[in-house]
C-alpha cells in the first residue's frame, strides 16, 4: 500500500519520515499519531496499537501537537501589578501583561518576569523618551525657555509663555507669569515640538496609557540600592 493510506501505527519505509501529525516512536519503531493541542499521551503506541490521548486536566495545557505524558502547568495567577490578557485553557498558558503605568523590566519567553512602575519625571524635567511595554521613561532637564511643573511619566517640557511684560520670569519648573496684558505662546529654542494640550492644573494623577500587549508575569522591582535616575522620582 502507498504510505498515504497506511493507518497508524505503521513502519515507515527506510529513509522516509512519518506523515503529518505523526511521530516516530523509537521503542515501537513505528509511526504513531500525535495528540492534538489540549491533549497529552495517556498511553504510548506499540507495534499494534496507536497512541491513546487524553484531555489536559484543569490548570494544565499543551499548545502544540505532542506526545508528552503530562500536560504543562499553567503559570501562577497574575500579580497585582498585572492584567490577565490570556486565560489558562487546555490549549494555552495564562498570559499576564503589565498594567498601565508599568513596563516589563525583565522578559521571559511568553510574558514578563518582572514589571516595574514607569519612572515619573519631576518638576524641571520632561519626558525625553516615552515608556514602552519593555522600556522605562527617560527624563531630561528642561532646556532654557521650557518648563515642566508636574511629576509625570508622560509630560514633556513645554515652552514658556512669552509676555509683553514679565511679572515673574519662568524657569525649568515654572512657567513665566505675565502682567495683565494677554500673553502669547512661543516655541522657544530647545522646546519639544510636539502637540501638547495646555492644562491649568498640575497633573499628579497616574497616567493611563494604552494597555501593554507584551505578555508578562511579574513582581515589583525592588527600588534597590541604586539611586533613581536624574530627574525622576521613586514615588
Amino acid at each position: 500500500l502507498p504510505a498515504q493510506v497506511a493507518f497508524t501505527p505503521y513502519a515507515p519505509e527506510p529513509g522516509s519520515t512519518c506523515r503529518l501529525r505523526e511521530y516516530y516512536d523509537q521503542t515501537a519503531q513505528m509511526c504513531c499519531s500525535k495528540c492534538s493541542p489540549g491533549q497529552h499521551a495517556k498511553v504510548f503506541c506499540t507495534k499494534t496499537s496507536d497512541t491513546v490521548c487524553d484531555s489536559c486536566e484543569d490548570s494544565t495545557y499543551t499548545q502544540l501537537w505532542n506526545w508528552v505524558p503530562e500536560c504543562l502547568s499553567c503559570g501562577s495567577r497574575c500579580s497585582s501589578d498585572q492584567v490577565e490578557t490570556q486565560a489558562c485553557t487546555r490549549e494555552q498558558n495564562r498570559i499576564c501583561t503589565c498594567r498601565p503605568g508599568w513596563y516589563c523590566a525583565l522578559s521571559k519567553q511568553e510574558g514578563c518576569r518582572l514589571c516595574a512602575p514607569l519612572r515619573k519625571c519631576r518638576p524641571g524635567f520632561g519626558v525625553a523618551r516615552p515608556g514602552t511595554e519593555t522600556s522605562d521613561v527617560v527624563c531630561k532637564p528642561c532646556a532654557p525657555g521650557t518648563f515642566s511643573n508636574t511629576t509625570s511619566s508622560t509630560d514633556i517640557c513645554r515652552p514658556h509663555q512669552i509676555c509683553n511684560v514679565v511679572a515673574i520670569p519662568g524657569n525649568a519648573s515654572m512657567d513665566a507669569v505675565c502682567t495683565s496684558t494677554s500673553p502669547t505662546r512661543s516655541m522657544a529654542p530647545g522646546a519639544v515640538h510636539l502637540p501638547q494640550p495646555v492644562s491649568t492644573r498640575s497633573q499628579h494623577t497616574q497616567p493611563t496609557p494604552e494597555p501593554s500587549t507584551a505578555p508578562s508575569t511579574s513582581f515589583l522591582l525592588p527600588m534597590g540600592p541604586s539611586p533613581p535616575a536624574e530627574g525622576s522620582t521613586g514615588d
Epitope: Q4, G15, S16, T17, R19, L20, R21, L64
Partner: antibody, heavy 119, light 107 residues
Framework: QVQLVQSGAEVKKPGASVKVSCKAS????????INWVRQAPGQGLEWIGW????????QFNENFKGRVTMTTDTSTSTAYMELRSLRSDDTAVYYC????????????WGQGTTVTVSS | DIQMTPSTSSLSASVGDRVTITCRAS??????LNWYQQKPGKAVKLLIY???KLHSGVPSRFSGSGSGTDFTLTISSLQPEDFATYYC?????????FGGGTKLELK
Amino acid sequence: QVQLVQSGAEVKKPGASVKVSCKASGYTFITYDINWVRQAPGQGLEWIGWIYPRDGNTQFNENFKGRVTMTTDTSTSTAYMELRSLRSDDTAVYYCARGDRDYGYFDVWGQGTTVTVSS
Amino acid sequence: DIQMTPSTSSLSASVGDRVTITCRASQDISNYLNWYQQKPGKAVKLLIYFKSKLHSGVPSRFSGSGSGTDFTLTISSLQPEDFATYYCQQGNTLPLTFGGGTKLELK
C-alpha cells in the same frame, strides 16, 4: 531574519538532471522540514516533497517518486533538490519552503529558481 | 489526491473594498486550510494557517473562515499592496495540494 536563498536559473536539455540549492539562515536548520514546491508557467503550485535535515529522511509526492532526490548539508545549512530525466513539462520555477508538519503549511519561502527544459 | 478549487481565477476590486476569496476542497479537510499571497518577483508569503490563525506579521485586515470543504479568505479593507494572487492549500493529507490561485486586480 529567517531566510531561504536559492541558486540561480538553469537551462537543461530533455533527459538531463538539475540540482537546485537552498541556503537557510536565521533559524536552527535541522529542526524544520525543507519542502520543495514548483510552479509551471501560468500554473498553480505543486508540492514535490520534504526532507527533514536532522536525519535526512524524506516524504515525496508519488508523482515525483523515483525521479527526485533531496539531500541536505547541515554544516552549511543548505538543502538540495535534484530532478532527473527532465522533460519539457518540468519547466517551472522551483521553490524551497520551510514547513510545519503539524498544520501542513509553509511559513518561509525561497525566491525561486527558474528551470527551463528545452532542446 | 485532494483537489482544491478557487471559486474564481480572477477578481476585480478597489482600494477600501471588503473582498472575499473562496476555496473548495474535494473532501473534508477539517480546519487544515492555509492561505498564501504571491506577487510577481517576490517570495510567496503565508497569510493564514489552520483556517483562521493569522501568521505573525500579517495585517489584521486578513482573516479566514469556513470548515470541512468550503473556506473563505477575507480582506476587510483592501490596500494597494494587497493586489496579488492568492492560493489556498490543504494541510490535511499527503500529498499537500494547492488551489489554482485567484488573481486580485484593480478595478
